[in-house]
Amino acid sequence: TIDTKRNISAEEGGSVILQCHFSSDTAEVTQVDWKQQDQLLAIYSVDLGWHVASVFSDRVVPGPSLGLTFQSLTMNDTGEYFCTYHTYPGGIYKGRIFLKVQES
């Protein structure tokens, strides 16, 4: 299952951690996809490491763990974020976070 804070808020110009927690007794995580609405933020592969989309590369830092740290937030960053955990042999699990960026 995926456990996450469904609604988070942060100040404009600040930073926020996007985090999903996956728990399973049997399945291992092989890949994690992070998206902002339909736009790719980053992909983590156990075998290949992190790929951060170039459009976000100056503001998105991998971690902690399989989460992302989103920096220099703007009002336009308000919206839905999705984590997709690819696991073996358990299949695919998805989580949703709504981020509200507030004026500082």
């Epitope: 890949q31 992909i43 592969s45 075998d47 290949l48 490491g49 992190w50 790929h51 991998p62 971690g63």
Partner: antibody
């Protein structure tokens, strides 16, 4: 014995294509990510591309993105590198390599296959 | 892309010397760093992975340390077979990248 054997290199004109193969033996090929690394004559190592065990995730060096395609056939214990629109700067010895599980360090390398791009 | 800067680019040393090679990453890469040894005409050989884990079969005179952006490979007592070129490689971010290499030569 764990072994990787590359083939398919040769002399090719700029703009043409070449397909490299890597035959794996002595380990369960389908359990591992695989990689291509190249080395231009007298130069250092350059990572070219990597592919996960199930082809679910793939990465490329910026210098080859859009021109090279990595693929694998687990049933044939084989890794491939399709190289299109070749340039003189692609001239190098191409190695395939296998990682230590969960470490991303490359512990088994082939002997390499030489690709020369020249008119 | 992550740039890895190795220093020195070459070092002259004698058998028995302690040799230290550094690798600096342009961004933090946690401990996802490996070290390789390469001799002329041969494929690279993995020495260290995970910044400090010694690969099976590699002599204990080789050791690695560091995390984040600064890493070190140390050869505690240089042996004749250690004269070679050494490369660091990061595997935290795609694309993976190698350092420019350090040639260890006989003084």
């Amino acid at each position: 014995e764990v072994q990787l054997v590359e083939s398919g290199g040769g002399l090719v004109q700029p703009g043409r294509s070449l397909r490299l193969s890597c035959a794996a033996s002595g380990f369960t090929f389908g359990d591992y990510a695989m990689h291509w690394v190249r080395q231009a004559p007298g130069k250092g190592l350059e990572w070219v591309s990597g592919i996960t065990w199930n082809s679910g995730s793939i990465g490329y060096a910026d210098s080859v993105k859009g021109r090279f395609t990595i693929s694998r056939d687990n049933a044939k214990n084989s890794l491939y590198l399709q190289m299109n629109s070749l340039r003189a700067e692609d001239t190098a010895l191409y190695y395939c390599a296998k990682p230590v599980p969960k470490s991303r360090g490359l512990d088994v390398w082939g002997q390499g296959t030489m690709v020369t791009v020249s008119s | 892309d992550i740039q890895l800067t190795q220093s020195p680019s070459s070092v002259s040393a004698s058998v028995g010397d302690r040799v230290t090679i550094t690798c600096r990453a342009s961004q933090g890469i946690s401990s996802w760093l490996a070290w390789y040894q390469q001799k002329p005409g041969k494929a690279p050989k993995l020495l260290i992975y995970g910044a400090s884990s010694l690969q099976s079969g590699v002599p204990s005179r080789f050791s690695g340390s560091g995390s984040g952006t600064d890493f070190t490979l140390t050869i505690s007592s240089l042996q004749p077979e250690d004269f070679a070129t050494y490369y660091c490689q990061q595997a935290f971010y795609l694309p993976w990248t190698f350092g420019g290499g350090t040639k260890v030569e006989i003084k």
